[in-house]
Amino acid sequence: RGVFRRDAHKSEVAHRFKDLGEENFKALVLIAFAQYLQQCPFEDHVKLVNEVTEFAKTCVADESAENCDKSLHTLFGDKLCTVATLRETYGEMADCCAKQEPERNECFLQHKDDNPNLPRLVRPEVDVMCTAFHDNEETFLKKYLYEIARRHPYFYAPELLFFAKRYKAAFTECCQAADKAACLLPKLDELRDEGKASSAKQRLKCASLQKFGERAFKAWAVARLSQRFPKAEFAEVSKLVTDLTKVHTECCHGDLLECADDRADLAKYICENQDSISSKLKECCEKPLLEKSHCIAEVENDEMPADLPSLAADFVESKDVCKNYAEAKDVFLGMFLYEYARRHPDYSVVLLLRLAKTYETTLEKCCAAADPHECYAKVFDEFKPLVEEPQNLIKQNCELFEQLGEYKFQNALLVRYTKKVPQVSTPTLVEVSRNLGKVGSKCCKHPEAKRMPCAEDYLSVVLNQLCVLHEKTPVSDRVTKCCTESLVNRRPCFSALEVDETYVPKEFNAETFTFHADICTLSEKERQIKKQTALVELVKHKPKATKEQLKAVMDDFAAFVEKCCKADDKETCFAEEGKKLVAASQAALGL
């Protein structure tokens, strides 16, 4: 019961243009190009997109026209390879153009940069933005797509269209408001934060598919959809998983037109069949397409069906477990995961996958044993420590978060993770630890039943950021090991890391701890990042420093910044008091 159109089209580009409409077609091609060629100027991309769009229109008019039968990869790859400055700007990526499809596209994918060397996006004054919006709305919105796509090369393209729609709505409303800034800025902050979260979530999906394969992604999807749609039967969940896997495989593979088209089809199917999927879909299904797809992706879990019997009967107590497993492995394990997940909305997806893996490993071992039933009879007992480990970790960390507040909780994690993997770059440690620390305000407010799925699945997303950033420039075998051995055990792997005893402390460099008056004009967030950067550097210099020592130095540092920012001659204060602070810190830490 696949929802996707399988019929052959003479012209793939014409087919997608007709399905998506000109506006979405152009937006998606722009996203695709910006995600591949992240350094190219906006104007160059717009020119390429216009050329592709004009060509697509000729194919709509006559599908038999020259080159209209070519694959989208061939058409888009050929277009990207016309960029004159490819070698100068991208170096070895230019070598991709010597390859034939599908190797050429694979080559472009491999050169996507998760941390491109691009300037930070600075938000202009509200009046400047509103003028730009009114002067040329189309260009203004294209620029938004371009800037997000090039900085987030795995951003979920159809979802970026939804963000752009909200971005446009914010400017349409707020640029007419009496107090433009009060109206617009909170909306832009919300879009920025949601956008970063959306990007990180999608990056994990792509990493799952690309590094661990389709089976790993499907297992994740079975668990998540079974939690979300516990009243849906297994065949329905399996069908949704197959279709969702296709959508994400396409988007992660750069096939953005197919991805957006198939996502729309999937949303249509879900809404047409909501009676057999979930009672929570009604409101989503009344919305326009982009909002509908987003809403379905975020929809709350349906209530568990009544009368679910114990799983033990079919999966532990039955003497026929090995026969069923041997003769229908994938169905049997899939059914186990589905049944377990729909009964446990209180578990994280990664925990459910750990349990399923433990179950599979036990059957592999026991079904070869002399008395299989006796061997697997206690398999559910093996689940207990696996369940208790994240429960205890979340309890401890939520207590710490409630005690410290977000900033100091982030600092505790900064110290913890710097000691675990001190070789990792300071900006990466700061970024990742700050995000890890956000788990507190995001999840600790929830009741017990919602804490684990919120916290552990969020941590999986954040640790994946560490993994993809580290993969670009690997510096730590421990990070590589935790990132590559098992997708579902990444968080327990990092949690289990102790202080790296092999690390040789970094040489002390006073310049690292020299601050200037410009810190005073920074936002509170930026100031925190400066302080947290200093904290990481301190730990790298003195990994054996105690919590008390680090706290004393950080308190002195905070007092120093506060004092000098109030001084008449700020720069002099920073120079003189800074020297004293460095000396006092060195003494306190025994550097």
Epitope: E233, F234, E236, D307, P309, A313, F315, E317, A328
Partner: antibody, heavy 120, light 108 residues
Framework: EVQLVESGGGRVQPGGSLRLSCAAS????????MNWVRQAPGKGLEWIGH???????YYATWAKGRFTISRDNSKNTVYLQMNSLRAEDTATYYC??????????????WGQGTQVTVSS | AFELTQSPSSLSASVGDRVTITCQAS??????LAWYQQKPGQPPKLLIY???DLTSGVPSRFSGSGSGTDFTLTISSLQPEDFATYYC??????????FGGGTKLTVL
């Protein structure tokens, strides 16, 4: 509406064969273990066998050899092929849905049954 | 395969009575026992599963207990619509299942 409808019953001579069908609507048969249960007039319930989500069939000891359960997922139908029928096979034959794909019980959903009479 | 012995095979009682039916398995089936109610000309209706879990929509006067080999169905206060035949079913020990012989509950 979620339901099971049996068909194919009737009168058959001893030694004859009969194929019963159980058509499901409102759900997908492939998600569940599908059972056949019979009840002779004035007697108790007797489980015949089932086919699970892995397409593996299991039978009561007495039913092995003469009875075969199969399914066609495209038609959303499960079948019971009965061969070498005897007078004591006269009964109402029910189709019942297991709780899950590999469940032998409990059975929350039952068909209304189809009557099979074996006599000369 | 295990066997289930249901007792009594027939029972007469009055409206308002407390009624108990037992089911004994020939080997341990943990808590994998269901109870059904059947009225003439109708298929069985699931009342209790996993020995003591009440099926949604079934009145709370029905309750089940037991584990291992000995199980009980109790109707706390008999209602006119409760006169029927009751069956126990053991499941889960293998991919086969067994029904008890039934208990016919009639009006005294």
């Amino acid at each position: 509406e979620v339901q099971l409808v049996e068909s194919g019953g009737g009168r058959v001579q001893p030694g004859g064969s009969l194929r019963l069908s159980c058509a499901a609507s409102g759900f997908s048969l492939s998600s569940y273990a599908m059972n056949w249960v019979r009840q002779a007039p004035g007697k108790g319930l007797e489980w015949i066998g089932h086919i699970n989500a892995g397409d593996i069939a299991y039978y009561a000891t007495w039913a092995k050899g003469r009875f075969t359960i199969s399914r066609d997922n495209s038609k959303n139908t499960v079948y019971l092929q009965m061969n070498s029928l005897r007078a004591e096979d006269t009964a109402t034959y029910y189709c019942a849905r297991g709780a899950g794909g590999f469940s032998t019980g409990p059975f929350k959903l039952w068909g209304q049954g189809t009557q099979v009479t074996v006599s000369s | 395969a295990f066997e289930l012995t249901q007792s009594p095979s027939s029972l007469s009682a009055s409206v308002g009575d407390r009624v108990t039916i037992t089911c004994q398995a020939s080997e341990s089936i943990n808590s994998r026992l269901a109870w059904y109610q059947q009225k003439p000309g109708q298929p069985p209706k699931l009342l209790i599963y996993d020995a003591s879990d009440l099926t949604s929509g079934v009145p709370s006067r029905f309750s089940g207990s037991g584990s291992g080999t000995d199980f009980t169905l109790t109707i706390s206060s008999l209602q006119p619509e409760d006169f029927a035949t009751y069956y126990c079913q053991g499941y889960g020990g293998s991919s086969t299942t067994t029904f008890g012989g039934g208990t016919k509950l009639t009006v005294l």
